[in-house]
Interface confidence: low
């Protein structure tokens, strides 16, 4: 079928359009183009005879039309009047006619639009502004852009006049933006230059900075005022209601207490005619004195005395603060503050309460600290310790013992041997000792300030022969895979070698065995049931040797997974069921049975006479070791068949 395609369909004035012919028949005589939707001689544009290849203009020819041999028509320099329908009339060689109609539309190229406004300086929250997009153009679409974004949805924004007018009701400072309008038609789109809306606003309530309201005497007062305003605000300062100056900043050097008062900043906008004020109250403080601490007891006795520390001087309406060891006060029932925080009481002082203590007086800007105070807490003496810890010595060596007891003031020491006073020194020295120097050695520590004394007694044995050693243990009943055991060979003797045997053999190499303390201590980590052996320690020196009695380690373990015997699971009706449960465990476990989940007896053996099919089910043995706190269990299914139906199965007896 013969068709006409317009390329393009929408044509801009001054451009060109091609009426393209599709499906042109064969064997043609010629063809003609007409303006309109029908063949009308008065509206013929051009005719074409194929044989002569001659084009003949018609009454509607404008000189802008070009016909192609394929019947397509090009129209150049399009004008508005060219809009509409065009008909192609085809005359075939057999003189049969065929027609087709096409059309196109002509639109003007749009000019660059501009924005007109009804109010160039609207006042915030008062005025409305109407923007109009110029010029008014037929068949054009109008669009608006704010800060290069499409219009936000807002009840204060309204489009009218075919979107040509944008009205902003009750403008705000946030409407200060770049506004553009755009005109569009099918052949062009143009944007206006931006128009910046200048919204007059403010002044808002001014802010005075810095916000500091408290100053010390002698400082400079420098206040600055700012209020959001368009155009910028004009500022005035008032002190206690009296005008000072018309500046944004107020500066008063070297202030005194007399400069305390109310400071008012007034902001004025000459365009909106509005005034706003803000008032700040400035307080100027005299410099407070440096505080110091007094104490009611400079040498308190530990666990007896209380100490009251007082922060001086006493000042009305002042906040007192305390620090101990440069930290704020810890929460403690032994620390009490008076109602005004000026007195800190330490109830029942300890040696850890020495301090240092500081108090502070707080004013608006900072805290004035006292010098630190340290308490001299009298304590002790604690139980003295005698070193070294050896109790056996060989004849001929020198005995040198030292005594120490924590004490303030430091303790005075005395030594006694078998109750007889020897000397008043911290150290006791006896050269070239003999068996006669064996005995009870007592160190006495005395605190002269508290009057308290404490003593420690040590047995010293001087002998060429070493004593028979013994083994002490830190854990007499360790639990398998959980506990460690430390054996120590006693006594501790000078110049002595310590040896160990397990089951009569020297120690095996094992990462779980560790010797320490000069081989005097043997530690077994993560004990197992296999560690339940006889342990012997030995001591020797150049003169003698001796072995301890064996100590057998009692390792608690289990219970392991129990075993139910006999292993049979099928029985004949009428037989006796006799099940025995066993689990490796130390100490022996407690046994209990459940049949089909129902508790039975707490015995190792479960006996049921003359079983029947009713005795079918699950038989569970539960084991529990109270010493290790561990449990275990096993379940066995028992099937009881009627007599003669279970081939080759023996009955439990």
């Amino acid at each position: 079928k013969l068709t006409i395609e317009s390329t393009p369909f929408n044509v801009a004035e001054g451009k060109e359009v091609l009426l393209l012919v599709h499906n042109l028949p064969q064997h043609l005589f010629g063809y003609s183009w007409y303006k309109g939707e029908r063949v009308d001689g008065n509206r013929q544009i051009i005719g074409y005879v194929i044989g002569t290849q001659q084009a003949t203009p018609g009454p509607a020819y404008s000189g802008r039309e070009i016909i192609y041999p394929n019947a397509s028509l090009l129209i150049q320099n399009i004008i508005q009047n060219d809009t509409g329908f065009y008909t192609l009339h085809v005359i075939k060689s057999d003189l049969v006619n065929e027609e087709a109609t096409g059309q196109f539309r002509v639109y003007p190229e749009l000019p660059k639009p501009s924005i007109s406004s009804n109010n160039s300086k609207p006042v915030e929250d008062k005025d409305a502004v109407a923007f109009t997009c110029e010029p008014e153009t037929q068949d054009a679409t109008y669009l608006w852009w704010v800060n290069n974004q499409s219009l936000p949805v807002s009840p204060r924004l309204q489009l009218s006049n075919g979107n040509r007018t944008l009205t902003l009701f009750n403008v705000t400072r946030n409407d200060t933006a770049s506004y553009k309008c755009e005109t569009q038609n099918p052949v062009s789109a143009r944007r206006s230059d931006s128009v910046i809306l200048n919204v007059l606003y403010g002044p808002d309530a001014p802010t005075i900075s810095p916000l500091n309201t408290s100053y010390r005497s002698g400082e400079n007062l420098n206040l600055s005022c700012h209020a959001a305003s368009n155009p910028p605000a004009q500022y005035s300062w008032f002190v206690n209601g009296t005008f000072q100056q018309s500046t944004q900043e107020l500066f008063i050097p070297n202030i005194t207490v007399n400069n305390s008062g109310s400071y008012t900043c007034q902001a004025h906008n000459s365009d909106t005619g509005l005034n706003r004020t803000t008032v700040t109250t400035i307080t100027v403080y005299a410099e407070p004195p440096k505080p110091f601490i007094t104490s009611n007891n400079s040498n308190p006795v530990e666990d007896e005395d209380a100490v009251a520390l007082t922060c001086e001087p006493e000042i009305q309406n002042t906040t007192y603060l305390w620090w101990v060891n440069n930290q704020s006060l810890p929460v403690s029932p032994r620390l009490q503050l008076s109602n005004d925080n000026r007195t800190l009481t330490l109830l029942s002082v300890t040696r850890n309460d020495v301090g240092p203590y500081e108090c502070g007086i707080q004013n608006e800007l900072s805290v004035d600290h006292s010098d630190p105070v340290i308490l001299n807490v009298l304590y002790g003496p604690d139980d003295p310790t005698i070193s070294p810890s050896y109790t056996y010595y060989r004849p001929g060596v020198n005995l040198s013992l030292s005594c120490h007891a924590a004490s303030n003031p430091p303790a005075q020491y005395s030594w006694l041997i078998d109750g007889n006073i020897q000397q008043h020194t911290q150290e006791l020295f006896i050269s070239n000792i003999t068996e006669k120097n064996s005995g009870l050695y007592t160190c006495q520590a005395n605190n002269s300030a508290s009057g308290h004394s404490r003593t420690t007694v040590k047995t010293i044995t001087v002998s060429a022969e070493l004593p028979k050693p013994s083994i002490s243990s830190n854990n007499s009943k360790p639990v398998e895979d959980k506990d460690a055991v430390a054996f120590t060979c006693e006594p501790e003797a000078q110049n002595t070698t310590y040896l160990w045997w397990v089951n009569g053999q020297s120690l095996p190499v094992s990462p779980r065995l560790q010797l320490s303390n000069g081989n005097r201590t043997l530690t077994l980590f993560n004990v197992t049931r296999n560690d339940a052996r006889a342990y012997v320690c030995g001591i020797q020196n150049s003169v003698s040797a001796n072995r301890s009695d064996p100590v057998t380690l009692d390792v608690l373990y289990g219970p392991d997974t129990p075993i139910i015997s006999p292993p049979d699971s099928s029985y004949l009706s009428g037989a006796n069921l006799n099940l025995s449960c066993h689990s490796a465990s130390n100490p022996s476990p407690q046994y209990s049975w459940r049949i089909n989940g129902i508790p039975q007896q707490h015995t190792q053996v479960l006996f049921i006479a003359k079983i029947t099919p009713n005795n079918n089910g699950t038989y569970a043995c539960f084991v529990s070791n109270l010493a290790t706190g561990r449990n275990n269990s096993i379940v066995k299914s028992i099937t009881v068949s009627a007599s003669g139906t279970s081939p080759g199965l023996s009955a439990g007896a």
């Epitope: 900075s209 810095p210 500091n212 408290s214 707080q362 900072s366 600290h369």
Partner: nanobody, 119 residues
Framework: EVQLVESGGGLVQPGGSLRLSCAAS????????IGWVRRAPGKEEELVAQ????????RYADSVKGRFTISADTSKNTAYLQMNSLRAEDTAVYYC????????????WGQGTTVTVSS
Amino acid sequence: EVQLVESGGGLVQPGGSLRLSCAASGFNIKDTCIGWVRRAPGKEEELVAQICQYHGSTRYADSVKGRFTISADTSKNTAYLQMNSLRAEDTAVYYCAIVGQNYPVYNYWGQGTTVTVSS
């Protein structure tokens, strides 16, 4: 002479971190409260954090809670502001100031350090 000198500002991407330092001289920071105040064009001055060494308290503006941490090293007489998870709205000039304990009052300003958060 009392002086506060800030440092550590700079350009950082959103989500990044900065640590501001405020070196104090002429007084002991353990005796008072130190605050960080920021000023950005078109925004109100904001006290973002303060630390009072002498009673061990810290306070933060809601806008920075969980992101900023204020601390002080009394041995160096220096306060710090660790700023994590920074946002574009944190862009401002940050000032160190002596601050009152119970209300946002400032005195003795530093010269400021600029923090710009931008991708």
